[in-house]
Amino acid sequence: QPSVSPGEPSPPSIHPAKSELIVRVGNEIRLLCIDPGFVKWTFEILDETNENKQNEWITEKAEATNTGKYTCTNKHGLSSSIYVFVRDPAKLFLVDRSLYGKEDNDTLVRCPLTDPEVTSYSLKGCQGKPLPKDLRFVPDPKAGITIKSVKRAYHRLCLHCSADQEGKSVLSDKFILKVRPAFKAVPVVSVSKASYLLREGEEFTVTCTIKDVSSSVYSTWKRENSQTKLQEKYNSWHHGDFNYERQATLTISSARVNDSGVFMCYANNTFGSANVTTTLEVVDKGFINIFPMINTTVFVNDGENVDLIVEYEAFPKPEHQQWIYMNRTFTDKWEDYPKSENESNIRYVSELHLTRLKGTEGGTYTFLVSNSDVNASIAFNVYVNTKPEILTYDRLVNGMLQCVAAGFPEPTIDWYFCPGTEQRCSASVLPVDVQTLNASGPPFGKLVVQSSIDSSAFKHNGTVECKAYNDVGKTSAYFNFAFKGNNKEQIHPHTLFTPRSHHHHHH
C-alpha cells in the first residue's frame, strides 16, 4: 500500500491491504477503496474491462471469471491495485482463445490462472504432440504464457496451457497460433508484356502479377505523371501459407492516341516497394516503315552475287510481301522473317538473294509489303559492272577508223599506233570524235561508246590499237596497215581481250 506524504496527492488505499487475494469459488469478494477523492473501481481480465462507481466492490458469489486485477482510481488520476484469484477446481484457466503472433515478436497465450498455487504452468502441444524444439516461453499466472520470438514455422500450431493441480495435469481449451509473417523482402512484381502497340479503338489490357507472403501487400496501377485513378480488376490466390499471388488487370476498353504512355504497376509492403512498367503506344492507323540494310544503289560485278536486304516495321502484322523485277514477281530466291520471336515484335527482315548476276540483269528491284491498313515499297537500283566488249571496228569510206565498245561503267577508248612490227603500241593517237551512243536509252544496260580517228595520219606500215577499258577490265582491237605504193591497205583486224590484271593474245 502507498505511504502518504503530506501536502501532495497520494494514491488510494485498498482494504484488504494486500497485492494479491485468493478467494474460493462461491465466496464473497469485498474490496474497499479508501480515498476522499474516490472516482471508480476498474476490473480487468483478458480482453475485458468493467467499471464500478461505488467505493466498495462487492461480488457476493465469486466465480472463476471474477479473477483479475481490481484498480481503484482517485480524482488526481492516482491508482492502487489488488489482484484477486477466484480458485475454482473446475476452471483452472481463464481463456481468450484468440491467439495471434507476429513473426520475430513475442506473443501472449492468454490463459491466466485462477489458482496461483498450482505448479508446472507451461505450454503443451495438442494431442500429445511435442512443441517445436526452438519454442521458448515465459509463464505469468496473472496474464498467461508469453511465446518468445514467434517463428513463421509456428503458424497453425495447436497448443494448450497446462498446469499441475493436486498432482494431476490439467489442460486448457486449445489455442491455434496464427502467425502474421514479417515482410523480409519487397514484393515480386511482373507484367504480362513490356510494351503494347494498338490502333485507336482497340482494347488495352495488361496484367500485373504481385507475389508476397501475405495478402496485405498493397498494389496499384498508376499512369506515369498522372494522378487519375485507374480501373483495375483483381484475382488472387493463396498457394499455401505465406505464398500469396494477386493479378491486377488494367483495362482500357477503347484506347485513344492520348492514352499512350507509361503505366506502372507499383506494390509495397512494410519492407519496401517494387514496380514494373509497361509502355502503351496507340496509333490512329497502322503503319509500315521500311529501312534498307544496304545502299539502295548497288554496284555488282558481272557473275557475282548480291543480297538485297530490308528491315521493316509493320503494324498490324504484314500480310503480303513480294520482290519484283521488270514487272515480274520472284517466287523464290527470297525469304521474309520476324526480327525477333518476341510477341511484341513488329520488326521484320526480307532478303532477296541475287546470284551470278549477268550484265543484262541490272535494273530496279522493288520490295513491296502491305498490311490491313497500308502499303509500302522500296526500290534498289542494281548496276552490273561488265568488262568492255568491242562491238565493231571498221575502216570507213571517208578514211576514218571507228571503234565501238560496250560495258559498265562507261568504257573509255584510247588509240595507239605501233610502227612496223613492234608489239607494244605506245604512241597515243587523239580521236577525232567520241560519242556515247545510248545515253538516253535504258538506264541500267551496258553503255556504248564510239570513238573515231583519221587514218590519214598514219604514214608508215604498222598497227593501230583501239583499247576499251573500265574498272572491270580492258579489251583491244588492232588494225594492221601496209603501204603498197601510195595506197594504204587494212589487213585482217583482230581483237585482244586483256583482263584487268592479265596480258595475253588471242589471234
Epitope: 484468440s98 495471434y100 496485405s216 488472387s236 493463396h238
Partner: antibody, heavy 118, light 107 residues
Framework: QVQLVQSGAEVKKPGSSVKVSCKAS????????ISWVRQAPGQGLEWMGT????????RYAQKFQGRVTITADESTSTAYMELSSLRSEDTAVYYC???????????WGQGTLVTVSS | DIQMTQSPSSLSASVGDRVTITCRAS??????LAWYQQKPGKAPKLLIY???SLQSGVPSRFSGSGSGTDFTLTISSLQPEDFATYYC?????????FGQGTKVEIK
C-alpha cells in the same frame, strides 16, 4: 465483455463515398483483427476486408480491392471502413466484427445501413 | 478464393426435429470453419468455431462436425428460437468466404 458500436445509417448518392466507424469498448483493441462484412437486402454475408492484428496493411476481398479502405485508430479504439464510387448495388447493412485473420468472428457490431440512391 | 456451398438453401421443420445443414468447401480447409445464426434485422451470432467447438453461451443442442471439405451443423432438437438463417464460413487463409445461407422455417 467486448462490444462493437457502429455509426448510424447513411444515405448516399451514386459515385460518392461513405465512411462507417466501429468503436470497440470493454477490451483491448490492438490485440485483435477487425473485419468488415456486408449484407445486401435479402442476400447473404460478404466479407470485405480485415485490418490487424498488429500494424501493417489491411487485407481486402478481391471484389472490393481498390474501392474499399479500412483503417484503425488505436488511440480511440475505432476502426473505419470507407467505400468509394458507390453504386446502387452497394446498398446494404455493413457490419464490423472482431476476428478475421484466419479466425471466426466472435463479436459483431449492430450494423450500419447504407442506402445508395439518386 | 475458396468457395463454400451450403445445402439445402432452405428447409421447413417442426419444434423438436433434428435438423442437419451441410457445407462443402471447394478445397480442403482442415477444420477452419465456423457456423453463424442470423435472425432478421440482427447481426449474425457465432455458434460453432473450428468446425466442432461450441462457442461460450451457445446451447448444447447445436453441434458441428467435419474436416477437410465436408462439414455439418446439427440442431438435435429444434426450438422455437432456432428459426433463423444459418451461414457457414471458412477462414483457412486470410481471405474469408461464407456459404450462401440456409433458411430454417417453421413447417
Amino acid at each position: 465483455q467486448v462490444q462493437l458500436v457502429q455509426s448510424g445509417a447513411e444515405v448516399k448518392k451514386p459515385g460518392s463515398s461513405v465512411k462507417v466507424s466501429c468503436k470497440a469498448s470493454g477490451g483491448t483493441f490492438s490485440s485483435y483483427a477487425i473485419s468488415w462484412v456486408r449484407q445486401a437486402p435479402g442476400q447473404g454475408l460478404e466479407w470485405m476486408g480485415t485490418i490487424g492484428p498488429f500494424e501493417g496493411q489491411p487485407r481486402y476481398a478481391q471484389k472490393f480491392q481498390g474501392r474499399v479502405t479500412i483503417t484503425a485508430d488505436e488511440s480511440t479504439s475505432t476502426a473505419y471502413m470507407e467505400l468509394s464510387s458507390l453504386r446502387s448495388e452497394d446498398t446494404a447493412v455493413y457490419y464490423c466484427a472482431r476476428g478475421g485473420y484466419i479466425s471466426d468472428f466472435d463479436v459483431w457490431g449492430q450494423g450500419t445501413l447504407v442506402t445508395v440512391s439518386s | 478464393d475458396i468457395q463454400m456451398t451450403q445445402s439445402p438453401s432452405s428447409l421447413s421443420a417442426s419444434v423438436g426435429d433434428r435438423v442437419t445443414i451441410t457445407c462443402r468447401a471447394s478445397q480442403s480447409i482442415s477444420n477452419y470453419l465456423a457456423w453463424y445464426q442470423q435472425k432478421p434485422g440482427k447481426a449474425p451470432k457465432l455458434l460453432i468455431y473450428d468446425a466442432s467447438s461450441l462457442q461460450s453461451g451457445v446451447p448444447s443442442r447445436f453441434s458441428g462436425s467435419g474436416s477437410g471439405t465436408d462439414f455439418t451443423l446439427t440442431i438435435s432438437s429444434l426450438q422455437p428460437e432456432d428459426f433463423a438463417t444459418y451461414y457457414c464460413q471458412q477462414y483457412y487463409y486470410e481471405s474469408i468466404t461464407f456459404g450462401q445461407g440456409t433458411k430454417v422455417e417453421i413447417k
